[in-house]
């Protein structure tokens, strides 16, 4: 029985050109995490394998950095990066847990209604 839950950073609104950290945390289970996949829609961004370490997809190498931890750092954000990101935890013996984060990237000139943009 799958007892675990995934906590995420929550949805994020950020400025074009900035960078953000996407993070998920698996709790309430003793299952062993064998691999974490990070995906956007149907595209694989990165894999963190318990034995083999990190692999960043070639098309994202310039703008995606591993970590912190099992998280992912997205840099040089563009409006086209707007969308849903998935952290997919492969565990044994539980199976797969998925977390979801929506990232909204806004033009730098847009500071609508005084929104506080996140640029770490």
């Amino acid at each position: 029985m799958m007892t675990g839950t995934i906590e995420t950073t929550g949805n994020i609104s950020a400025e074009k050109g900035g960078s953000i950290i996407l993070q998920c945390h698996l709790s309430s289970t003793t299952a062993q995490v064998t691999q974490v996949n990070w995906e956007q829609q149907d595209q694989l961004l990165a894999i963190c394998n318990a034995d083999l370490g990190w692999h960043i997809s070639p098309s994202f190498k310039d703008r995606v950095a591993p970590g912190p931890g099992l998280g992912l750092t997205l840099q040089s954000l563009t409006v086209n990066d707007t969308g849903e990101y998935f952290c997919i935890y492969h565990t044994y013996p539980d199976g797969t847990y998925t977390g979801r984060i929506f990232l909204e990237v806004l033009e730098s000139s847009v500071a609508e209604h005084g929104a506080r943009f996140q640029i770490p």
């Epitope: 950073t9 929550g10 086209n80 969308g83 979801r100 806004l106 847009v110 609508e112 929104a115 506080r116």
Partner: antibody, heavy 119, light 112 residues
């Protein structure tokens, strides 16, 4: 002036599919997400999902995955929601609503489309 | 999914009253950067819902200052300082911090 004009009321048979439209005007269409919300029985509101016209990115409430499909036609500033395999549970008023940039809220709403599923 | 609980379900009022509506979430609505995406809406009969408050406490354009929002973490409140006839209807809070976005069950503001 921001306006969202939705298609008219629909009476459809169980098992059928239906496409509702939401035509936007008065703002830069591609720069804002468009959300869809269901209101059943005159009370509770449920978020179905959203689409970002700029790149076509979508996000769905998993409850509606396989039930609703969101698409966009940038040339006509129109967002569509297709509802599949309709049952009486899908009878409701459906709203499109523009996303408020930077705040994950909805600032302007369409007038709603009433859908009745009945044989 | 994040569960959003609104109280009370029904709120009988007299014009001129001050009222509060509570909205509680099953987990914190602050994201990892400290931003909280909690908004309030009024849905009047025969109309579309309208945005009142976004980001906990920001009044949307054209919303009278008798409406105010407050709170943090998991507990949020909408206050209406002097009830007017046009304020009657269903009030909903919405959390947009976690996927999927979820609404509270609604509070019906009606005349005593």
């Amino acid at each position: 002036e921001v306006q969202l004009q939705q298609s008219g009321p629909e009476l459809v048979k169980p098992g059928a599919s239906l496409k509702i439209s939401c035509k936007a005007s008065g703002y830069s269409f591609t720069g804002y997400t468009m959300n869809w919300v269901k209101q059943s029985h005159g009370k509770n509101l449920e978020w179905i999902g959203l689409i970002f016209p700029y790149n076509g990115a979508t996000s769905y409430n998993q409850k509606f995955q396989g039930k609703a499909t969101l698409t966009v036609d940038k040339s006509s500033n129109t967002t569509y929601m297709e509802l599949l395999s309709l049952t009486s549970e899908d009878s409701a008023v459906y709203y499109c609503a523009r996303g408020l940039r930077g705040y994950f809220a909805m600032d302007y709403w369409g007038q709603g489309t009433s859908v009745t599923v009945s044989s | 999914d994040v569960v959003v609980t609104q109280t009370p379900l029904s709120l009988p009022v007299s014009f001129g009253d001050q009222v509060s509506i509570s909205c509680r979430s099953s987990q914190s609505l602050a994201n990892s950067y400290g931003n909280t995406y909690l908004s309030w809406y009024l849905h009047k009969p025969g109309q579309s819902p309208q945005l009142l408050i976004y980001g906990i406490s920001n009044r949307f354009s054209g919303v009278p200052d008798r409406f105010s929002g407050s709170g943090s973490g998991t507990d949020f409140t909408l206050k209406i300082s002097t009830i007017k006839p046009e304020d009657l209807g269903m009030y909903y809070c919405l959390q947009g911090t976690h996927q999927p976005w979820t609404f509270g069950g609604g509070t019906k503001l009606e005349i005593k």
